[in-house]
C-alpha cells in the first residue's frame, strides 16, 4: 500500500513538475527590466527563450520572436537545449511511469517488470529535473553577469552627465517557475526510485543451503534466490535482479518443476 502511494505520489509530483518545466520554457518572462534605482520608463521590457516583449504604459504589448538561430548567444541556445531535453525526458518518463503504476494492470505484467519501468521513469524524472534546474541556473548566471556589467557601464558621458541609461535585466517569473518545477520533477523521480525498491520481488539475507545428491541434484534455496538444476560443478547460487532473466554463465542451468522463485 505504501509502495503504491509512494509511486502514485511520485508520478503526480513529476507530472506537476514537468508541466511547470513546459510552462517555464514557453514563458516570456525569463528576464525582466530592472525597475529598481532606474529612471521610470514608459515601456517595460521582458524577454523569454523564444521572443522578447515590450509592454507600453498603455497596456499594449508587442512581442518579437528571435528569428535567427546563428545570431543568438551560445548560452541561450544551451538553455533552450537543456529545457527541451528536460521536457522530452520528462514526457518519456511520464509515459513509462503510467504503465509502471501498480494500480494499473496491463495484461500479465509482472511486478519485476513494473519495478524496472518505475526505476527507468524515476531516473528519467531525475535527469529531467536536473536539466531544468541546470538550464534555469545557467540563464540566471548569465543575467547576473550582464546585470553587473551594465551597472558598471550605466553612467557614461562627459562631466558625469547621464548620456545613456542602459536597460538592466533581472530575474523573471519563469526562472522561479523553472527552479520549482525542476525541483518537483527531481523529487518525483526520487520517489519513483524509492517505490521501485518496494515493487521489486522480496529478498532475504539468509544464506542459501544446497543439498547435493549423488546423481541429479536439486538445490533448494529460500525466497529471492533462484533454484537451479546443477550438473557437476556448474551448480550456482544466483540472486535474481532481473525477474527470471538468465546470465550468460547460466546457459547450462535448466529449470525444474521443483524450482522456487
Amino acid at each position: 500500500m505504501a509502495v503504491t502511494a509512494c509511486q502514485g505520489l511520485g508520478f503526480v509530483v513529476s507530472l506537476i513538475g514537468i508541466a511547470g518545466i513546459i510552462a517555464a520554457t514557453c514563458m516570456d518572462q525569463w528576464s525582466t527590466q530592472d525597475l529598481y534605482n532606474n529612471p521610470v520608463t514608459a515601456v517595460f521590457n521582458y524577454q523569454g527563450l523564444w521572443r522578447s516583449c515590450v509592454r507600453e504604459s498603455s497596456g499594449f504589448t508587442e512581442c518579437r520572436g528571435y528569428f535567427t538561430l546563428l545570431g543568438l548567444p551560445a548560452m541561450l541556445q544551451a538553455v533552450r537545449a537543456l529545457m527541451i531535453v528536460g521536457i522530452v525526458l520528462g514526457a518519456i518518463g511520464l509515459l513509462v511511469s503510467i504503465f509502471a503504476l501498480k494500480c494499473i494492470r496491463i495484461g500479465s505484467m509482472e511486478d519485476s517488470a513494473k519495478a524496472n519501468m518505475t526505476l527507468t521513469s524515476g531516473i528519467m524524472f531525475i535527469v529531467s529535473g536536473l536539466c531544468a534546474i541546470a538550464g534555469v541556473s545557467v540563464f540566471a548566471n548569465m543575467l547576473v553577469t550582464n546585470f553587473w556589467m551594465s551597472t558598471a557601464n550605466m553612467y557614461t558621458g562627459m562631466g558625469g552627465m547621464v548620456q545613456t541609461v542602459q536597460t538592466r535585466y533581472t530575474f523573471g517569473a519563469a526562472l522561479f517557475v523553472g527552479w520549482v518545477a525542476g525541483g518537483l520533477t527531481l523529487i518525483g523521480g526520487v520517489m519513483m526510485c524509492i517505490a521501485c525498491r518496494g515493487l521489486a520481488p522480496e529478498e532475504t539475507n539468509y544464506k542459501a543451503v544446497s543439498y547435493h545428491a549423488s546423481g541429479h541434484s536439486v538445490a533448494y534455496k529460500p525466497g529471492g534466490f533462484k533454484a537451479s538444476t546443477g550438473f557437476g560443478s556448474n551448480t550456482k547460487n544466483k540472486k535474481i535482479y532481473d525477474g527470471g532473466a538468465r546470465t550468460e554463465d547460466e546457459v547450462q542451468s535448466y529449470p525444474s518443476k521443483h524450482d522456487y522463485v
Partner: antibody, heavy 117, light 113 residues
Amino acid sequence: QVQLKESGPGLVAPSQSLSITCTVSGFSLTDYGVSWIRQPPGKGLEWLGVIWGGGNAYYNSALKSRLSISKDNSKSQVFLKMNSLRTDDTAMYYCAKNGLLRYLDYWGQGSTLTVSS
Amino acid sequence: DTVMTQSPSSLTVTAGEKVTMSCKSSQSLLNSGNQKNYLTWYQQKPGQPPKLLIYWASTRESGVPDRFTGSGSGRDFTLTISSVQVEDLAIYYCQNDYYYPLTFGAGTKVELK
C-alpha cells in the same frame, strides 16, 4: 468619432484650487490613457501628467505635489485638480487621448485658465 | 528629468525650400527591447491644438504628407520637410516619450520669408 472637450472655471484667484474636466467620446477610458498638457501664452507645451486605462497615473515632477489626475470611467470623464495656484499657472489646458502606442493622437480644443486676483 | 533641446528656435523659409530642424535629448530615447526610439514630433498651427506628425522618431502618422520625414537615433533627432508649403507654417515640438515625466522641447517656429 473621437472627441475630447475640456471645461474649466476660466478665472481663478491665486492660492485657490483648479478643477478641469475632460469629457471624452468615441473611445473607452478603460482602454486608453488621457494626458494633460498646458501651454502658457506665447510659450511652449508642458506635459502635466497622464492617467492610464488601468487607473495608474504619472505626473510632471515639478508639479507633482499640487497635481492630481483622476477619472470616472462610467461618465467618460477625466479630472485635473491643481491646488495652490500661482499667476504663472495661467495657460491653455489641453487634454489629449493616448493611442495604444502612447503618442497623443487626439487633442481637445483646450480650456483657458487665468490666475489673477 | 529628460531635457529636450530644439534648434533653431525659429526658421524663415520660402515655399518649396527644404527645411531641417534638430532635437537633442539629454538621455538616449532608444529602447533596447525593441530597438525603437521613443521620440514624437507634433505640429501646432496658431490658435489650434497640436497635431501628431511622427512617432517612434521616423514613423509617419496616417494622413501626414510624405514630405515630412523623421530621422535620428539615441539622443539626436531631425525633422525634415522636403518642400515646405504655406500650410506647413507652424511651431514644431519634439517630445521625449520614453522617460517619465514625458517632456517637450521648446519648439521650432517655421515662418514665411
